[in-house]
Structure formats: C-alpha cells, structure tokens
C-alpha cells in the first residue's frame, strides 16, 4: 500500500549489524509523486566499488546509488548525510553484509518521503502535445483555442473529422487553408454518394503542400484516400505527387489526413464529383451491342443480340437476345449469358426414308433425308439436303422447314413379266411381276394398289361388299400363304356415283362407271412384291390406240379351274369397241341389245384366246406409260366380258383420273398430305 | 406390326446398377430416334431420354443425366438404357417409343417395371 | 423448361357428353410439336392427336385438337364407352427436355 513517507532502518540499528544479510525495501508512494530518500546515519564497512558491505537505491533497472563507509552532514544545521530524488513513485532499498567485519558497524538510517514531481519539466519527453500544467501529484495538459484535447488527455488537435460529404459534387480543403495546417491532427472527411455513382477526385500539383516525407521516405504529415478495400497514397511533399484525377471506383472514399508536431505547410485544396460508375464494354462473342457506345455508365441498358445462328439459353428457352444493365457495383446484369450456336436437335424421322446421323446438330450442320430406294422417291424435290438454321430448324432451300415427303414408286415391277403360255391363253406369273395385284377373298377378286392408303378396283366387286378382306405380296392364295401375305383392313368402300345400283346385280347389263376405291385404315409398306401401280395422265399420250398391248393378271378362272390358287398373267392388245359389240354373251341373262357398252369402256383381247374371266375382276389392265418405258399405268380394271377366251370389258381408267384424285384428296389424314 | 419389347427391369438396391433393353421389329429401326420414357407408379408420364437414328446424339433428362446413358445396336434392331447409381425415386415403368414427325412418339412398348428399394 | 398444366385433372362427364381437356403452356410452343396421348389402367399409352390437331391412325373422328402459342384443347364431340382414359399432352422443344401434362382422367359419372 503506497505510503506518503517511511523510515528505513539497517537490522539491529543502532547496534551492529550482522554479517552476512541481505535486505531489501520496496519503497512505493501514490501515483504522481516522485521520492525523497535521505539517510541520517550511515556506518558501513568500506570498501572499494562498496564490494564487502552496502546500501543499494535501484529505481526500476537504475542503480542510483551504492553507499559505504561513514558520512557525516555538511550542514550543521541538517541531519541529512546522503540523498536521493527521483520523480517515480517506486524505489528499492537493497542492504547487504559480508562474512566478516574488523570493526563494529552501526549500519544506516535513512527516511523517505513522497514529493511532487513537475512533469512538464522533469521529463525528456514532453506530455503534452501544447500546454503542461502541474500540481501536486500530478499534471494536466491543455490546447489552444480552436484545438481541443484527445481522448488521450495529451494531444490537442483541431476539430476537422466527422465531416460526410453527399453532394455529387464539392470541394475539401485542410484547416485553415491556405494558411498552415494544426500540427498534430488527424482528419477525416467522408464522401458517400449515391449507389452506382464513383467518387473521382481531383487536384491542382500547386493546391498541395504538405511536410514532405523523411529520408526513408515515409511521409511525416499525409494525405490518404481510402475507397472499399483500395487505397490511394500516402502523399506528401510540396506539389500533388500522385494523380491529377483519381477514379476511385467507388461510391464511398474516406480522405484521412494525418498530421505530427513539426513542420506546417499550407496543406491541400481538391474538388470531387460523382460519375456514373462505368462498366467495362466487355467482349460478347458471337454478338452485337446496341446502342454502341465508347464508354457504358450506371443505368445504361444494352440490348445484346446473337449473330444468326447463335442463341442464348437461359432455363432450357432459348431467345436471339437479352438486356443487359449497368449496375452501380460497375458490373453487367446478365453477365453469365453468352451467345451460343443454336442446336437444332436430333432430326425428325420421315416415313420410308431415313436421315443419316450428322456429326452436330449445331448451327450449319448438313443433314440429307433420303428414301427407301428404289420402292419410294422424294415427291416434293429439295434433293433432301437440309442445313441447321438460324431459328433452330433444319432447312431446305427449296421446301423451308418442309420435311421431304418419300412417296411410293409407282408401276415399276422388280421382275418384269415373261410369258410362259399356259391359262386361258395365258401364262404363271410371279406377284413381283405385278407388286400392285391385290387380292379380293369375297367375292373372289382383284383389285389395283395405287398408293399407300388406296386400292383400286371395279365398283361391281365392292357393290355387295363394303368391307372386303384384301391381300397384297403373295403370288399364291392359298390359305396358308394367305397367313404370311400381308392383309389390308379397308376404312371406307367409295363407289363412283355414276355407277346404278340394282336389286339384282346378277342381272346386270350396264356396267358403265364400273369403278370404286377401297380407302385403307393403315398405309401400306411398299417392297419388292408389294408396290403401287401409276395412275394415267391426263394428256392425249395416254389415249388407247387399237394394238397397243396391256397386261392382265389375277387369280380368276381358267381353263381348267374355276379359281386359280397361283398368279396368272396375260399380254392382249386394245380392240375396237365394236370387236366387243359383235362377241355373243355366253350366258345372257338379258337381250343380246340390253348390254350397255360406252366410251369409259376399253375392249381388249381376241389373240390367242388371251381373256380375263371371272375372278380377275378389278384388277389392272397394265399398260406400258407413253413417256416413261420403265413403268407401267393402270389404263384399265377387269370390268365384264361376253365370253371368257375371246374379248373382254375394262373400265377405261382415264376418264375417272379427276374422280379418282378428287375422292383421294377429300378423304386423306393429314400424314398423306 | 411395329413392335416395341422392353426388358431388363426388376428390383434393385439404391446405388445399384440396371441395365434395359427394346428390342424393336416390324419398322427400319435404324431410320428412327427412339426414347425412353418413365411412369412412377400412379404418377404421370415423364420423358427420360432421346437418342438419334445413328446413335451420335443423345439427350437425357438433367436428373438422371450423368446416371444413365442410352444407347443403340442397329444391327440388332436394340435400344438400351444403362442406369447407374439408381435411387428410390427412379422407381417406375420404363417405356421405349419410336419417335416419328415432329417427335410424336407413335409407338410405345408396354414396358418394363424398375424397383429401387433396400 | 416448359411446364405444362393440364386442367382438370379429373373430368367426371357421361357418354354422350361433350369433354373438353386443357392444356397449358408455361412459355409459347410451336404447334407442330404439341401431341396429345391416351392411356388405360395398365397399358401403355397411344399417340392419340399429333401435331396439335392431326389424329393418329384408328383414332375416331369424333376426337379433334386445336390450339396455339400455350393454350391447347383436345375435345371429343359425343363420349363413347370406350374413351374413358387419362390423357396427356406433350411437347418437344429441340433444346429439351421433352415435358409432359400430369394428364386428365376422363371418367364416366
């Protein structure tokens, strides 16, 4: 417990002390006083530097003093042999004896007692940065006018922080200039502008003067910019050493200028304003930036628009362009969007053909359709190259979007038809020598494939059968080999209006109009033994002249059976009309007169005994087409005959082509169109 | 008649493997994108993954993609599904469909059931 | 992705009866490639209405579908027996994925 005076005592005074002790006082007065230590009496054994016996005064790691030997006062009218003054407010007292003394010592009294100590003056280093003020245990410092003193009750500085500067535009200067700065200060302005808006600081070489830095280089007196985590100096010297134009990047800058004791200068003037903060004019491949600006600021909005063939994809969507903002941290919203080429993805299937894989399905990419050779060909043209586009579809040149359409080859047989003389004059035949025959179970005839969805055949076999069975791609009918063959489920029988129905069709003798389709419910699939016969055209090409020769097939009688269980064909001319008139019907079942013959009939035969007969009805009388040798069209149907074995009836197909494609049309799905 | 046969499914364990197959006839197999599709018991429809007629190019849902990968053998008229590191929530009839114009899938088979419990 | 809704979810209606089967688009979709598909307890399901409008073979007349942009319909003029079945819609965007409607169940009240 810190005490205001003491007394001090060797062991034993004021008789001898013993040898060989070691004693120490701790001396401590209140804070703010300093020591006042004084010996009365000192008897010590002397000896050199006091190395046997002493007294020792230490004052923190400061010996201030070893004493021995005897003293007496030098002033009769003071006790006082030996003195100490320190201004701490701690000592120790240290009392040491050797093993042996030759005489007898009394040792020592010494008194302390707590004194002021002057703080301003008793010190090297200076307390206060302006004005000391002592009293008795203590000291207070004080400033100046205008200054006022720091939390650390030693330093005076001038009141220059705390200011915050929100105008987009305004200008700083130090205290007092031009005059000289406070010494000893620290300032702090804050600029806080609105966000999206930089700080950009400016400042004239002459408006600076600062205590310039010392020979380390390390400025005494600085100017300090601090934006987010950049910073701009420390300066100093006399002229702005550093930029004339700071861009800060920020919407916040503190300035901090820092002062020490010495050297004043005038200080430091600058203006500062607000700019929008910039953003980069970054580069966006595959695009275009509108509008285009040499320098994009806060608030600037761009339109980004991908060259064709590239996209930006966002959530699986993709869109030719996006928005792009500036934003006050000085980035682009958006930024993690990129123009990319468009895929087109995988390309669509098409019905009997194919399309090869590409390498990509990017933008440019080349893909070519093709159809199922040689059963089918590309109806539509465009010569099935298609390119990856722009808008994400596949392209043609000629169609666009279109996809190719692979329509049937029509009236091409895979093995053409060699006479073998056999049938009713006719010959064996193989159904890939007629891939159009199709086969009618009840009533037992035929009948004309014409395309995927159509059958063609006389209106006379369908009459009394509006859902017949049909079959395709067998040369025999069989049972058994019906079971393989494929089967066709008719839809919709359409009967040609012109065509009179009677109570009793036995009794027949008109069979102008005899024509019908047989709409499919599913298309067929075309291949060597099953394929479409072509329908005539419309030109004078294919008018029938007399001798030019057709071809007949079917599975009717012959002479020696009433149904034949193989394909059978014939080659027979075209006869005159009249050749028909003039045959006697076999089994008449009317007048002679009563049998209606008219220009939709073509009469065909007489050679050889070639005829169709009953059970070839509806199928095609196949005639070689005028303007294309390597197909066949269906000039007629099997239709009636007076007399099996010499001329037979056929519907002349040409005068029902409008009907035929009319009906079609009418009656198709959309997969036809 | 265009037929789509599915096999290859059963029960399996989370983090399990299995692998699925189509075997397709009566069409060109090889002239046709095919797609596998799934339905969770009592759920809806979900589209799975898509490849192109050669094989080069395939698309698989983001949840499963990395997991399972399709695949084809045009000569033996099979597409596949290998799946990987199967969980519980992958549970569901697995379909094959062909893909036909304007990628409608015009023929599906009748699917094959994958079970993911422990 | 595309997410499509399809309302309701259940359709109680008579044979006889006129339905009506939503489907919406959560973004605009090309008609072409918006189909439509039917399926029964326990089979698979059948292409029913490609295209928007198109029906598939074997798909009775009295079905039609329209629609365009994200609002697609499939109606049937005079329910049949026969039609009672949950029905889909789908589409395809080439930069996938494939997204289906979590279907209509058409049943008889």
């Known amino acids: 417990e810190p005490t205001m005076y003491g007394e001090i005592l060797s062991p034993n005074y004021p008789q001898a002390y013993p040898s060989e002790v070691e004693k120490s006082w701790d001396i401590e007065v209140p804070e703010g006083y300093g020591i006042h230590l004084y010996f009365t009496h000192l008897d010590i054994e002397l000896s050199e530097n006091c190395a046997y016996d002493s007294v020792q005064i230490i004052s923190g790691d400061t010996e201030e003093g070893r004493l021995c030997g005897q003293r007496s006062s030098n002033n009769p009218h003071s006790p006082i042999v030996e003195e100490f003054q320190v201004p701490y407010n701690k000592l120790q007292v240290i009392f040491k004896s050797d093993f042996s003394n030759e005489e007898r010592f009394t040792g020592f009294a010494a008194y302390y007692v707590a004194t002021d100590i002057n703080e301003c003056t008793d010190f090297v280093d200076v307390p206060c940065s302006h004005f000391c003020n002592n009293f008795i245990g203590g000291y207070f410092c004080s400033c100046p006018p205008e200054y006022f003193l720091h939390d650390d009750m030693k330093n005076c500085g001038v009141n220059c922080s705390g200011d915050v500067f929100t105008a987009l535009i305004g200008e700083i200067a130090s205290p007092n200039y031009p005059k000289p700065y406070p010494e000893n200060s620290r300032c702090e302005y804050q600029i806080r502008l609105e966000k999206g808006f930089q700080v950009v600081v400016t400042l004239r070489r002459e408006d600076f003067d600062v205590e310039a830095a010392d020979s380390a280089g390390n400025c005494l007196d600085s100017l300090v910019f601090v934006a987010g985590d950049r910073q701009f100096g420390p300066y100093c010297g006399h002229g702005f050493p550093g930029p004339l134009n700071i861009e800060t990047k920020s919407n916040a800058l503190d300035i901090i200028f820092q002062t020490d004791l010495t050297g004043q200068k005038k200080g430091w003037k600058l203006r500062y304003h607000g700019d929008p903060m910039p953003c980069p004019k970054e580069d966006t491949p595959n695009s275009v930036w509108e509008p285009a600006k040499a320098k994009y600021v806060f608030r600037d909005v761009v339109q980004i628009t991908c060259l064709d063939g590239f996209e930006v994809v966002e959530g699986r969507v993709g869109a030719t362009s996006f928005y792009s903002t500036c934003q006050s941290n000085g980035k682009w919203s958006n930024s993690k969007l990129k123009c990319q080429p468009v895929d087109c993805g995988i390309p669509e299937s098409i019905e009997n053909g194919k399309v090869e894989d590409p390498e990509s399905t990017l933008f440019g990419s080349v893909i070519r359709y093709t159809c199922e050779e040689p059963y089918y060909y590309m109806e539509n043209g465009g010569g099935g190259e298609y390119h990856c586009a722009g808008n994400g579809s596949w392209v043609n040149e000629v169609l666009g979007p279109e996809l190719p359409k692979c329509v049937p080859v029509c009236g091409v047989p895979r093995e053409p038809f060699e006479e073998k003389q056999r049938i009713i004059g006719g010959s064996d035949a193989d159904i890939k020598n007629f891939p159009w025959q199709v086969f009618f179970d009840n009533p037992w005839a035929g009948g004309a494939l014409i395309n995927e969805y159509w059958v063609l055949t006389a209106a006379h076999v369908v009459e009394g059968n509006r859902e017949p069975t049909m079959y395709v791609g067998s040369t025999s009918v069989q049972t058994s080999r019906l079971a393989k063959s494929k089967m066709l489920t008719p839809e919709h029988v359409f009967i040609h209006p012109g065509w009179k129905l009677l109570e009793v069709p036995e009794g027949r003798t008109n069979f102008d109009n005899d024509i019908a389709l047989v709409r499919l419910k599913d298309p067929v699939k075309m291949g060597p033994t099953v394929s479409p016969i072509c329908l005539p055209g419309t030109s004078s090409d294919y008018n029938l002249m007399d001798g030019d020769l057709g071809l007949i097939s079917g599975w009717g009688r012959t002479e020696k059976r009433d149904r034949a269980v193989r394909l059978k064909a014939a080659r027979l001319p075209v006869a005159p009309l009249r050749k028909c008139k003039e045959v006697k019907v076999e089994k008449p079942t009317a007048d002679a007169e009563a049998y209606v013959f008219t220009p939709n009939m073509i009469c065909a035969g007489g050679e050889k005994g070639m005829d169709s007969c009953k059970g070839d009805s509806g199928g095609a009388f196949a005639v070689q087409d005028p303007n294309d040798k390597t197909k066949f069209y269906a000039a007629g149907l099997v239709s009636w005959g007076p007399q099996c074995g010499t001329y037979g009836l056929y519907t002349r197909v040409k005068n029902y082509v409008d009907w035929i494609m009319k009906t079609m049309q009418e009656n198709s799905t959309p997969r036809e169109d | 008649e265009v037929m789509l046969v599915e096999s290859g499914g059963g029960l399996v364990k989370p983090g399990g493997s299995l692998r699925l197959s189509c075997a397709a006839s009566g069409f060109e197999f090889e002239n046709y994108a095919m797609s596998w599709v799934r339905q969770a018991p009592g759920k809806g429809l979900e589209w799975v993954a898509t490849i192109s007629s050669g094989g080069s190019h395939t698309y698989e849902l983001d949840s499963v993609d990395g997991r399972f990968t399709i695949s084809r053998d045009n000569s033996k008229d099979t597409l596949y599904l290998q799946m990987n590191s199967l969980r519980a929530e992958d549970t569901a009839l697995y379909y094959c469909?062909?893909?036909?114009?304007?990628?409608?899938?015009?023929?599906w088979g009748q699917g094959t059931l994958v079970t993911v419990s422990s | 992705q595309i997410v499509l809704t399809q309302s309701p979810a259940t359709l109680s209606l008579s044979p006889g009866e006129r339905a009506t089967l939503s489907c919406t688009a959560s973004s605009e979709v090309s008609s072409s490639y918006l189909h439509w598909y039917q399926q029964k307890p326990g089979k698979a399901p059948k292409l029913w209405i490609y295209s928007t409008s198109n029906l598939a073979s074997g798909v009775p007349s009295r079905f039609s579908g329209s629609g365009s942009g994200t609002d697609y319909t499939l109606t049937i003029s005079s329910l049949q027996p026969e039609d009672f079945a949950t029905y889909y819609c789908h589409q395809y965007y080439r930069l996938h994925p494939i997204t289906f409607g979590q279907g209509t169940k058409l049943e008889i009240k």
């Open positions: 469909a062909r893909l036909f114009t304007k990628h409608a899938m015009d023929y």
